[in-house]
């Protein structure tokens, strides 16, 4: 980078090399070149010579002033016009950055995806900081008082094998960058309460010819959790509003769910599950598309036919249940 050049002087930034976006800043350049009394000192930002707001401070130093600096990153360097030299002489360079202090992390969530062997903790980091921001996840056992810390740039996967302090923990997140530090509220968790069942997957659909044609959706999960509650949502692709069916499910066999749908319409289905009575749901499964036939013949849609343009973690399961209308989209 620009900071690795051999300098014949010094460049510095006030208030600092990393500063809050929108601030007024001053960049100073001080030449220290043998037998060069600079007639002029020039500043360059990202290779382009600056023309305005340059003030000569003394024989070897000049200042460049920026009002309301909004660029996240810039490479600055300065040069001297030396008498008897045919070209400008490089003095020094520096990379500068602007951004924001971190917001208080909120919505701290820790879940254990079944079979993953990890507790995954995520949070809402707030507004973009534009500068390097690190997060320290604190995990403190409520039984042993032992605390562990994990450094990360985004979310964190913590091996469940490392959680040796029993089942109950406090989790909180510290966010820090060059401009500030903030700490989230503490989240109390019980390891048994945060398990999310193995992803539910819709495998196929068929429409059966009967007096009233019906569509059967086949779906399954590899979960070993006994009590699982699921939701399946569906709608015509032309609609905005989802219909939702709720199920209490036992995944000892492939689930079959029946729907009475309009003929000759393309529908989309998704499923998600949670351990019954617990807090966290799986994400909605991948979109599964099925077009109902115009008239009599049987139509089957298989999982490999569904569109891949909206993937995500596949999740959910269904059996029999009641129907609701859902405008809410994904449920946390």
């Amino acid at each position: 980078g620009i900071t690795n050049i051999n300098c014949s002087g010094h460049i510095w930034v006030e208030p600092a090399t990393i500063f809050k976006m929108g601030m007024n800043i001053s960049i100073y350049c001080q030449a220290a070149i043998k037998n060069c009394q600079p007639r002029k000192l020039h500043f360059y930002k990202n290779g382009i010579k600056e023309r305005f707001q340059i003030t000569r401070i003394n024989k070897t130093t000049a200042r460049l002033w920026y009002k309301n600096f909004l660029e996240p990153h810039a490479s600055m360097y300065c040069t001297a016009e030396c008498p008897k030299h045919f070209q400008e002489t490089l003095i020094c360079g520096k990379d500068i950055s602007s951004g924001y202090p971190p917001d208080i992390p909120d919505e701290v969530t820790c879940v254990i995806y079944e079979y993953s062997g990890n507790m995954t903790c995520t949070w809402n980091a707030g507004k973009l900081t534009y500068i390097d921001t690190k997060y320290v996840v604190h995990v403190k056992s409520l039984e042993t008082e032992e605390e562990q810390q994990y450094l990360t740039s985004s979310y964190i996967n913590i091996s469940t094998d490392s959680l040796q302090g029993g089942k109950k923990y406090l989790v909180w997140v510290q966010a820090a960058n060059a401009l500030g530090m903030e700490e989230s509220k503490q989240l109390q968790i019980h390891l048994d309460d945060i398990v999310i069942p193995s992803a539910a997957v819709i495998s196929r659909a068929e429409t059966i010819n009967a007096t009233v044609p019906k569509t059967i959706i086949y779906w399954d999960s590899q979960t070993t959790i006994e009590k699982v509650s699921c939701e399946m949502r569906y709608k015509a692709t032309t609609n905005q509003t989802w219909n939702v069916k709720e199920f209490d499910t036992n995944f000892t066999y492939v689930q079959q769910s029946e729907f009475y749908l309009e003929p000759n319409i393309k529908y989309v289905f998704q499923v998600r599950c949670q351990e019954t009575g617990k807090r966290y749901w799986q994400p909605w499964s991948s979109l599964f598309f099925h077009k109902t036939p115009e008239t009599v013949p049987q139509v089957t849609s298989k999982a490999f036919q569904h569109d891949t343009w909206n993937s995500g973690l596949t999740v959910a399961s269904i059996s029999t249940g009641h129907l609701t209308s859902d405008n809410r989209g994904d449920i946390g």
Partner: antibody, heavy 116, light 107 residues
Framework: QVQMVQSGAEVKRPGASVKVSCKVS????????IHWVRQAPGKGLEWMGG????????IYAQRFQGRLTMPEDTSTDTAYMELSSLTSEDTAVYYC?????????WGQGTLVTVSS | DIQMTQSPSTLSASVGDRVTITCRAS??????LAWYQQKPGKAPKLLIY???SLESGVPSRFSGSGSGTEFTLTISSLQPDDFATYYC?????????FGQGTKVEIN
């Protein structure tokens, strides 16, 4: 183009001090390194001191240390050479010059005569 | 301090002559050497800098060469206006020092 105009001739008693001025135009003193050179009657040139841009300070020739100062008034772009404890050996023409390395602009010179 | 020794001290020459003045430094000064011309009652005038670079406006009959400790100023064809005293000056190390001067006079 740099122009340097020096103050007029001075006659001083031994032990006294002299202050010679050098008014700069065309550039400001913030852009120029000023040096002072003297020349005794019928003798060669002698560098007294000047601004070193590599280290950002004024350097004085060893033989003048302690009795030579080179103040500047940037508000009027005037440089000064002040020499104290004068003796007859300090009788010379004193030149201000710029720009550092080498000296490509010179004042017209100021004759300082030290006589009892 | 670095000593600068010029030779000769005085040089008699005629118009049209090729004139060479030498300057020796007591230690290496790389190419940080200047040559000046001075006429009676006048301030010195820069001719050559960095040992061999001709100052703007100086006639091309003046040239400089050398590096380290040995330097020369050459006037290829002496003109009437060239009769003056010439000084070398090192500006490698403070204190800067001048040679004692070479007076070029009419033969």
């Amino acid at each position: 183009q740099v122009q340097m105009v020096q103050s007029g001739a001075e006659v001083k008693r031994p032990g006294a001090s002299v202050k010679v001025s050098c008014k700069v135009s065309g550039y400001t003193l913030n852009e120029l390194g000023i040096h002072w050179v003297r020349q005794a009657p019928g003798k060669g040139l002698e560098w007294m001191g000047g601004f070193d841009p590599e280290h950002g300070k004024i350097i004085y020739a060893q033989r003048f240390q302690g009795r030579l100062t080179m103040p500047e008034d940037t508000s009027t772009d005037t440089a000064y050479m002040e020499l104290s404890s004068l003796t007859s050996e300090d009788t010379a023409v004193y030149y201000c010059a710029t720009v550092a390395a080498p000296l490509d602009y010179w004042g017209q010179g100021t004759l300082v005569t030290v006589s009892s | 301090d670095i000593q600068m020794t010029q030779s000769p001290s005085t040089l008699s020459a005629s118009v049209g002559d090729r004139v060479t003045i030498t300057c020796r430094a007591s230690q290496s000064i790389s190419s940080w050497l200047a040559w000046y011309q001075q006429k009676p009652g006048k301030a010195p005038k820069l001719l050559i800098y960095k040992a061999s670079s001709l100052e703007s406006g100086v006639p091309s009959r003046f040239s400089g060469s050398g590096s380290g400790t040995e330097f020369t100023l050459t006037i290829s064809s002496l003109q009437p206006d060239d009769f003056a005293t010439y000084y070398c000056q090192q500006y490698d190390i403070y204190s800067w020092t001048f040679g004692q001067g070479t007076k070029v006079e009419i033969n």
